[in-house]
């Protein structure tokens, strides 16, 4: 059994600068960028866990101020704590940076629950365990927040890696990754390997353990097994994709595929759960319950509220089904599927269990804003955000948690007709009505 224990994060990686300095062809993403250079400095540069987010170390300002920043593919602002807050160990002090420039503009971001607000500016930003470059980027200095920072999460800001269309206050505020690509020779691509531990980690264990890797500008072949399969990015706002079929233990949910993408389907590292539209969630839970009917769990468990506990080491993984999401492929009428295990969608919870118990929350939940493929999905896979070619790649992660009987999988091709019909066309509304609400 692979428990997902990983080596401690290397704090001082030496070595030559990354071999990513080749000029980019305008329309051409480098052929398999992972072969172009060494990504050793970026491997294992994430820490954290699905319940509280994965973060990367970044430096801001001159002299550099080091902060831990949540990696979020579901938003597009680079925003950092810039005032004292009970849950922050440190924060960005603009007055200490000689390179800070005030944009004299405020920004307010409301969530379904909670919010943050701040002041916009620019400063010099770099990623110590990333490409050897420094960029001037927009920064939202968070001066006030409610239910945004998480006690004990160890991150002080958020790196929104999605597109300008969903940036706040509007799409004229260039996101960090756009600035990075414009100002450097870093290819327009990044990849994420999020590594769930498979068991609860306390605070000190999280600090000492590896949460995964964010490879900026390329693909690292050591982080996945098998082949990468790509699905088109439907629209460049969120990382929107199209799901064409859903199976529970190989049994088709048999719903109109539009339901799976109502009103969108996105890949979002800043969300914990796999979130499904109401109708799809109800059908999926019904099917999961049926598949695991030898045991019965409380209603609150399926709502993601109550924890179910088993004596340590006796979790009956075999009674829970695998879940397969079929994604639109790059070729007409071709799809591929990604399959996750209960080891991904049952999330270990710390602090409640005794050493005699393993306790879990059901990490699939209902959504009113479409499907969200959050950390519990991403923890099964190495995910390539190939912005240059407007596609997202999935391969089985080298660090995913599994057992001796089953493993996560990425398989294809499958013949699927009329996949374009699976996309939902959202009626045009004022962008300011968008609410970001993520569990």
């Amino acid at each position: 059994t692979q428990h997902g224990i990983r080596l401690p994060l290397r704090s001082g990686l030496g070595g030559a600068p990354l071999g990513l300095r080749l000029p980019r062809e305008t329309d051409e993403e480098p052929e398999e960028p992972g072969r172009r250079g060494s990504f050793v400095e970026m491997v294992d540069n994430l820490r954290g866990k699905s319940g509280q987010g994965y973060y990367v170390e970044m430096t801001v300002g001159s002299p550099p101020q080091t902060l831990n920043i949540l990696v979020d593919t579901g938003s597009s602002n680079f925003a950092v704590g810039a005032a004292p807050h009970p849950f922050l160990h440190r924060y960005y002090q603009r007055q200490l940076s000689s390179t800070y420039r005030d944009l004299r503009k405020g920004v307010y971001v409301p969530y379904t629950q909670g919010k943050w607000e701040g002041e916009l500016g620019t400063d010099l930003v770099s990623i110590p365990h990333g490409p050897n470059v420094t960029v001037r980027a927009n920064i939202a200095a968070i001066t006030e927040s409610d239910k945004f920072f998480i006690n004990g999460s160890n991150w002080e800001g958020i790196l929104g890696l999605a597109y300008a269309e969903i940036a706040r206050p509007d799409d004229s505020l260039e996101p960090f990754f756009d600035s990075l690509v414009k100002q450097t020779h870093v290819p327009n691509l990044f990849s994420l390997q999020l590594c769930g531990a498979g068991f609860p980690l306390n605070q000190s264990e999280v600090l000492a353990s590896v949460g995964g890797s964010m490879i900026i500008g390329g693909i690292d072949h050591s982080l996945y097994t098998g082949s990468l399969w790509y699905t088109p990015i439907r629209r460049e706002w969120y990382y929107e994709v199209i799901i064409v079929r859903v199976e529970i233990n190989g049994q088709d949910l048999k719903m109109d595929c539009k339901e799976y993408n109502y009103d969108k389907s996105i890949v979002d590292s800043g969300t914990t759960n796999l979130r499904l539209p109401k109708k799809v969630f109800e059908a999926a839970v019904k099917s999961i319950k049926a598949a695991s009917s030898t045991e019965k769990f409380p209603d609150g468990f399926w709502l993601g509220e109550q924890l179910v506990c088993w004596q340590a080491g006796t979790t009956p993984w075999n009674i829970f089904p695998v879940i397969s999401l079929y994604l639109m492929g790059e070729v007409t009428n071709q799809s591929f599927r990604i399959t996750i295990l209960p080891q991904q969608y049952l999330r270990p919870v710390e602090d409640v269990a005794t050493s005699q118990d393993d306790c879990y929350k059901f990490a699939i939940s209902q959504s009113s804003t479409g499907t969200v493929m959050g950390a519990v999905i991403m923890e099964g896979f190495y995910v390539v955000f190939d912005r240059a070619r407007k596609r997202i790649g999935f391969a089985v992660s080298a660090c995913h948690v599994h057992d001796e009987f089953r493993t996560a999988a990425v398989e294809g091709p499958f013949v699927t007709l009329d996949m374009e019909d699976c996309g939902y066309n959202i009626p045009q509304t004022d962008e300011s009505t968008l609410m970001t609400g993520r569990a």
Epitope: S293, T294, K296, F297, P298, Q306, L307, C309, D351, V352
Partner: antibody
Amino acid sequence: QLQLQESGPGLVKPSETLSLTCTVSGGSISSSSYYWGWIRQPPGKGLEWIGSIYYSGSTYYNPSLKSRVTISVDTSKNQFSLKLSSVTAADTAVYYCARVGHGISYFDLWGRGTLVTVSS
Amino acid sequence: EIVLTQSPATLSLSPGERATLSCRASQSVSSYLAWYQQKPGQAPRLLIYDASKRATGIPARFSGSGSGTDFTLTISSLEPEDFAVYYCQQVYTWPPRTFGGGTKVEIK
């Protein structure tokens, strides 16, 4: 209406096995809406959960008692049973059987209880 | 492990008075908490579940409140039959197994 009734010997010798049965009447033990559980209460003390069982036979036990406890179900007789091995005086208690309802979370219906004394 | 602490251990009141019983969890149990009443020589009886919902047949004078770590059982006006021991139980972690130590409500 549904009722639960515990039965079994009131006196058990130390080191022997305590055996109790709970008979469910007025309803089916095979309902998918309930678990069935055993709880005990030493004289003058509080309540201690022993374990629970589903009609399929799936069981959950209190970790502190797990090595000594077996709970089983007989759907044909509408009964579930408790066996507690290697008993000592500390196992002297009133033993209750109960239904776990309200979203399979709370003990919403209890038997009257039976006192089991462990003594030589 | 989640520990439930009930206070006071004993509450001495007269019929007609208001009784306020407390149950504190060592960490949040959301609203997954129940209250049981146990009279001498009898089995416990479910009074309140999900912190504030009255079980079938329970008089309106019994009410539950709270969420997270602090919970209260209130008996608005004590009847003679209400003098008993009251237990809280959390089911945030399942299977249900953790009870508080009990509060005895006795006649003053």
